[in-house]
């Protein structure tokens, strides 16, 4: 007869490991008992379990409640056992020693490999601002056994660097993604992809990029100067800019306070029926946590009774 087992049994942390040991005997041969022991190098054999044809299953106190026989029906020549809820410390060498009649004793060894799937974490880098040089966008760390693979999935142009730390029973891998921030990256996904033999599918953690910037400001509403005449209703100026975080707007008049009746509504300055009083230099001040911009325009309200038009100046300042 001969023993049938596996060289390596691989199981994911927390799952049950079947340790196979089957005696392929000749007709009439019987298995009296199967002794399972852990036999790591440099240490004596440690009892796991004893399967006896008459006495049944004896489990070592160290493995009490964790070792069982596979569910029925059972072949009397099958000395396999189930190790419940495998933990990392279970990883190692195991031996089954089979006592048969009349052929004598046989033994075989196998290695139990316990895969520890990683639980990845993604940490965003410092705040990204347009105009910075190469900056850390995010780092992704995953620890497992064996060492996981950490890569990045993104449309954003950047560079990656990885480092690994070996522990006694696992390895931690950290990958960093660096980029030169630009406003076009705003809202773009940056995904950390972790691969590991203990995972059914890759684990993905997505971070949305936020790049602080503030565009130049400009004012719209004075495109047709002839519309700005005494008595006109619904005249308005709109301040144009964009930024991250979204900017706030403030209107002032350079040559005095805002005339009465003029309404400020965020980026819009609304006028009552126009009078010559409304002529002046208006300043739109745009700001966010990153920067601030100004744009100023000169409003000249025309008197329709006058023939000659006035020149309108548009000045933008930062």
């Amino acid at each position: 007869g001969e023993l049938e087992t596996s060289d390596v049994v691989t199981v994911v942390l927390g799952q049950d490991a079947k340790l196979p040991c089957f005696y392929r005997g000749d007709s009439g041969e019987q298995v009296g008992q199967v002794a399972w022991a852990r036999v790591d190098a440099g240490e004596g054999a440690q009892e796991l379990a004893l399967l006896h044809s008459k006495y049944g299953l004896h489990v070592s106190p160290a493995y009490e409640g964790r070792v069982e026989q596979p569910p029925p029906p059972r072949n009397p020549l099958d000395g396999s056992v189930l190790l419940r809820n495998a933990v990392q410390a279970d990883e190692g060498e195991y031996e089954c020693r089979v006592s048969t009649f009349p052929a004598g004793s046989f033994q075989a060894r196998l290695r139990l490999r316990v895969l520890v799937p990683p639980l990845p974490s993604l940490n965003p880098g410092p705040a990204l601002e347009e105009g910075q040089g190469l900056t850390l966008a995010a780092s992704c760390t995953a620890e497992g056994s064996p060492a996981p693979s950490v890569t990045w999935d993104t449309e954003v142009k950047g560079t990656t660097s990885s480092r690994s730390f070996k522990h006694s029973r696992s390895a931690a891998v950290t990958s960093e993604f660096h980029l030169v921030p630009s406003r076009s990256m705003n809202g773009q996904p940056l995904t950390c992809v972790v691969s590991h033999p203990g995972l059914l599918q890759d684990q993905r953690i997505t971070h949305i990029l936020h790049v602080s910037f503030l565009a130049e400001a400009s004012v719209r509403g004075l495109e047709d100067q002839n519309l700005w005449h005494i008595g006109r209703e619904g005249a308005m100026l709109k301040c144009l800019s964009e930024g991250q975080p979204p900017p706030s707007y403030n209107w002032t008049r350079l040559d005095g306070p805002l005339p009465s009746g003029v309404r400020v509504d965020g980026d819009t300055l609304g006028f009552p029926p126009l009078t010559t009083e409304h002529s002046g230099i208006y300043v739109c001040h745009v700001s966010n946590e990153f920067s601030s911009r100004d744009s100023q325009v000169t409003v000249d309200v025309l008197d329709p009774q006058e023939d000659s038009g006035k020149q309108v100046d548009l000045v933008s300042a930062s």
Partner: antibody
């Protein structure tokens, strides 16, 4: 024929010592686990101590730990129990018994027993 | 330590009666259970090992059953020589422990 014969029992004062012997024959003594089991007058059976074949690892009941010592001489096919600091509650018939080692520290039932030797601890 | 609880502690029966003695372990012991018979002034005698296996030379009227925590010794037809005290013993762990015994007396 398997035989186990105990000797060495007798009357001893509290605090005294006694050495019991168990002579084995009819089987390969060195390959069996051996144990001592006692029975106080009118009481049930109580396991006292055991010794493994091979490396002679020893085991004791809490009630005798530190006072009793089990040993074996495989060349003489003899099991011993050295009893020190004896107490009145150690009064009992002491039996030696054999059991086959299956594996590790797992044994069969004790299939052969000696006839016993009486130990009386009294002043 | 594993506690072994035997019941009843004593019983009276007549020759030819069917007698059942039970033994319960405080935790699972698979089939690492033996039954012994002891007569006054004599050493215990192994009747049943591995919960249900009959020791060589023991009459077939003795039988054992059970596994795990609950075990039974049955004497199918009590004979005069069967009046004695019966003990169960677990040898799953060290220390091996005995039940308190069941005395079978003549009715």
């Amino acid at each position: 024929e398997v035989q186990l014969v105990e000797s060495g029992g007798g009357l001893v004062q509290p605090g005294g010592s006694l050495r019991l012997s168990c002579a084995a024959s009819g089987f390969t003594f060195g390959t069996y686990g051996m144990s001592w089991v006692r029975q106080a007058p009118g009481k049930g059976l109580e396991w006292v101590s055991g010794i493994k074949p091979g490396d002679s690892t020893t085991y004791y009941a809490d009630s005798v730990k530190g006072r009793f010592t089990i040993s074996r001489d495989n060349s003489k096919n003899t099991l011993y129990l050295q009893m020190n600091s004896l107490r009145a509650e150690d009064t009992a018939v002491y039996y030696c018994a054999r059991a086959e080692l299956l594996a590790f520290d797992v044994y069969t039932a004790s299939d052969y027993w000696g006839q016993g030797t009486l130990v009386t601890v009294s002043s | 330590d594993i506690q072994m609880t035997q019941s009843p502690s004593s019983l009276s029966a007549s020759v030819g009666d069917r007698v059942t003695i039970t033994c319960r372990a405080s935790q699972g012991i698979s089939s690492y259970l033996a039954w012994y018979q002891q007569k006054p002034g004599k050493a215990p005698k192994l009747l049943i090992y591995a919960a249900s296996s009959l020791q060589s030379g023991v009459p077939s009227r003795f039988s054992g059953s059970g596994s795990g925590t609950d075990f039974t010794l049955t004497i199918s037809s009590l004979q005069p020589e069967d009046f004695a005290t019966y003990y169960c013993q677990q040898h799953y762990t060290t220390p091996p422990t005995f039940g308190q015994g069941t005395k079978v007396e003549i009715k």
